[in-house]
Interface confidence: low
């Protein structure tokens, strides 16, 4: 949000006399720096210093003691903190020309003579004059090439492959550049970048491998950013595949991984000839050792109805891949002897899902089931109890005379899961017992009648009712009921 720095002189361009000195002042609201045409080796006569002044602004002065043709170019003043490698410098610019009658063109590095163009794209042949007034023509093997010229940049146009020469005349003297070689490369307007990490979870000591592939482009700069980058821990490789189409495969390998190598692995591909950029990222985690986590989707006590089909699903997170087995009452589940099946499927890289399936639940399926997951570093288990719910049924209803005392006990045995409740009813008028309204529930607190209940095992219960004295014929009904059903029998 800082306003752009200001430059004095406040001009877009300035012509400076050969061998004279010149200075450029930059004012900014934060610390400012200069970017200028020459490389650091060539810039011995360029001095940059900070200047104290009474403006409250940061002032940086660029001074050239003896201007030469090589000083011709764009000078940019920018805020230090805004400079990033990717984007063009955002700042204030001034273009300086230093006309030299003996140097018509600004000296260039050898790489500048290689001009890379993409299929039918425009390009710049960077022959820049030291004097803005110098007329320039562009030639190739066929003669003069029509192209627009800007002394700050060079010739701009659509050029066919081959050598090009810039020609200028200064005070009757002819100057020619060495040939600029225009070279065409395969490139697309969008970068097709794919990242592949066969694994994203590792443990200490393993080798991390990540690849990025760029399709249909020859002019690509690819940078890796990853946690171990500062230590230079990774090994990068490039493989160029030409058939059936161009594919550049960049591989990053990080051997002997540690927990510190966990984090984001990013590849950023950039086209060398245009501002097209694409990036892909994957998060890699490195664990000190292998691990297992078990997450059941049900509780530790589960019920199933008789003959029901039911699935019990357990989510497992593990690395390295686990072996998963099921036990029933601490014995390995032998699936072919029961109507119980288990399976394991891989959901994601380190996520697995195991299912225990009851096809038609039977009473004998009740018990303790355990899932065990293990790998070379860890073992985890989860146990739950399964109850097969059986509707209540009466097994037996008998009476027992007490001889001379005239007392009588009726015993009712019932089974079911959950254990049935037993209720007693009596009908005192035998002739009317077909009518439900003639039956009354036997209350516990009636004198001369005692009711008791005893469970014989987990699924069998026995109820008793004792009549101290039976003076007339009565009918007795035993009602056994649980969540799944009720049954009654009469005596």
């Amino acid at each position: 949000q800082l306003s752009l720095p200001s430059i004095l002189p406040n001009e877009n361009e300035k012509v400076v006399q050969l061998n004279s000195s010149f200075s450029l002042r930059c004012f900014g609201e934060s610390e400012v720096s200069w970017q200028y045409p020459m490389s650091e080796e060539e810039s011995s006569d360029v001095e940059i210093r900070n200047e104290e002044n009474n403006s409250g602004l940061f002032v940086t002065v660029l001074e050239v003691s003896s201007a030469s043709a090589a000083h011709t170019g764009l000078y940019t003043c920018y805020y230090n903190h805004t400079q990033t490698e990717e984007n063009e410098l955002e700042g204030r610019h001034i273009y300086i020309y230093v006309p030299d009658p003996d140097v018509a063109f600004v000296p260039l590095g050898m790489t500048d003579y290689l001009v890379i163009v993409e299929d039918d794209d425009s390009a710049i042949i960077p022959c820049r004059t030291t004097d803005p007034e110098t007329p320039v023509t562009l030639h190739n093997s066929e003669g003069v090439v029509p192209a627009s010229y800007d002394s700050r940049q060079g010739f701009n146009g659509t050029f066919t492959v081959g050598p090009y020469i810039c020609e200028a005349t200064v005070k009757g003297k002819k100057f020619q550049t060495i040939p600029f070689n225009v070279y065409a490369l395969k490139a697309t307007s969008e970068l097709d970048l794919e990242m592949e990490a066969l694994k994203t979870v590792y443990k200490s000591g393993e080798t991390i491998v990540v690849t990025c592939a760029v399709f249909n482009n020859e002019v690509v700069d690819l940078q890796w950013t990853y946690p171990g980058e500062v230590k230079g821990k990774g090994i990068t490789m490039l493989e160029e595949i030409k058939v059936p189409s161009i594919k550049l495969v960049y591989t990053l390998t990080v051997p002997e991984a540690t927990v510190k190598d966990s984090g984001d692995y990013e590849c950023a591909a950039r086209q060398a000839t245009r501002e097209v950029k694409e990036m892909k990222k994957v998060t890699i985690s490195v664990h000190e050792k292998g691990f297992i986590e078990i997450k059941p989707t049900f509780s530790q006590l589960e019920a199933v109805n008789l003959h029901e089909v039911k699935h019990f699903v357990v989510e497992v997170r593990a690395y390295p891949p686990p072996r998963i087995s099921w036990l029933k009452n601490n014995l390995t589940l032998i699936e072919n002897l029961t109507e119980i099946t288990t399976d394991v499927e891989k959901i994601q890289e380190i996520r697995y899902r195991s299912k225990l399936k009851l096809i038609r639940a039977k009473e004998e399926d009740s018990g303790h089931y355990t899932i065990v997951a293990q790998n070379e570093d860890a073992v985890k288990s989860y146990t739950f109890e399964l109850l097969t719910q059986v509707p209540s049924s009466i097994l037996d209803l008998v009476d027992d005379h007490h001889g001379s005392t005239g007392g009588q006990t009726v015993r009712c045995t019932a089974e079911g899961t959950p254990l049935p409740d037993i209720e007693w009813m009596i009908c005192k008028d035998i002739k009317k017992c077909n009518n439900e309204t003639s039956w009354t529930i036997l209350a516990n607190n009636v004198s001369n009648i005692i009711t008791e209940i005893h469970s014989r095992d987990r699924s069998t219960v026995e109820g008793r009712v004792t009549f101290a004295k039976v003076e007339e014929t009565i009918a007795v009904r035993c009602l056994a009921k649980n969540l799944l059903g009720a049954e009654n029998r009469e005596l």
Epitope: E29, S30, S55
Partner: antibody
């Protein structure tokens, strides 16, 4: 020596208009952002707005945007503040300043809004 | 708008004491903060800019620190002439805003 001199203040009726000027000297006026700041009697400082060197960007404090207009004339080295629809709460000492922050402020011109 | 809060309207101190004035921004303003001194009947006088840079000619007993949302202005040894109102200002984003001011009184 850098100098900023405000003028144009005075007594104005509620709903009226007034144009303040700030004459700059001693520096290259054409490369600096310029600001207006005001201070009501006995109160703190309130930033009014700023204008960039070529007048292509002008920023105002939102509550004053519809009643104040900042402009400049680089040829005359002068900054302006056109005030309209003034109210009693616009009574203040009006300062012009070089940049968004900085050491160079004028001495201020007093605007009094009263019936 | 970014609100700059100076928690103390008044601070009382003695000559030779160390005094710190705080300013809190309602959101991150990086280091785009200036501190001004204003004496009665005068225009504000810049002391610190960019949070910690002392302006030319300002005595080194005045210092500034902080970044983000919390800023501190310190006078290491108060002098009688330091009696004034001190303002912080953010110039990170428009509208630029000032703190309410802290009046330094000498006992």
């Amino acid at each position: 020596e850098v100098k900023l001199l405000e003028s144009g203040g005075g007594l104005v009726q509620p709903g009226g208009s007034l144009k303040l000027s700030c004459a700059a000297s001693g520096f290259d006026f054409s490369i600096f952002w310029m600001s207006w700041v005001r201070q009501a009697p006995g109160k703190g400082l309130e930033w009014i707005g700023e204008i960039n060197p070529d007048s292509s960007t002008i920023n105002y404090t939102p509550s004053l945007k519809d009643k104040f207009i900042i402009s400049r004339d680089n040829a005359k080295n002068t900054l302006y503040l056109q005030m309209s629809k003034v109210r009693s709460e616009d009574t203040a000492l009006y300062f012009c300043a070089r940049q968004r922050f900085g050491p160079y402020w004028g001495q201020g011109t007093l605007v009094t809004v009263s019936a | 708008d970014i609100v700059m809060t100076q928690s103390h309207k008044f601070m009382s101190t003695s000559v030779g004491d160390r005094v710190s004035i705080t300013c809190k921004a309602s959101q991150d303003v990086s280091t785009a903060v200036a501190w001004y001194q204003q004496k009665p009947g005068q225009s504000p006088n810049l002391l610190i800019y960019s949070a910690s840079y002392r302006y030319t000619g300002v005595p080194d007993r005045f210092t500034g620190s902080g970044s983000g949302t919390d800023f501190t202005f310190t006078i290491s040894s108060v002098q009688a002439e330091d009696l004034a109102v001190y303002y912080c200002q953010q110039y990170y984003s428009t509208p630029y805003t000032f703190g309410g001011g802290t009046k330094l009184e000498i006992k």
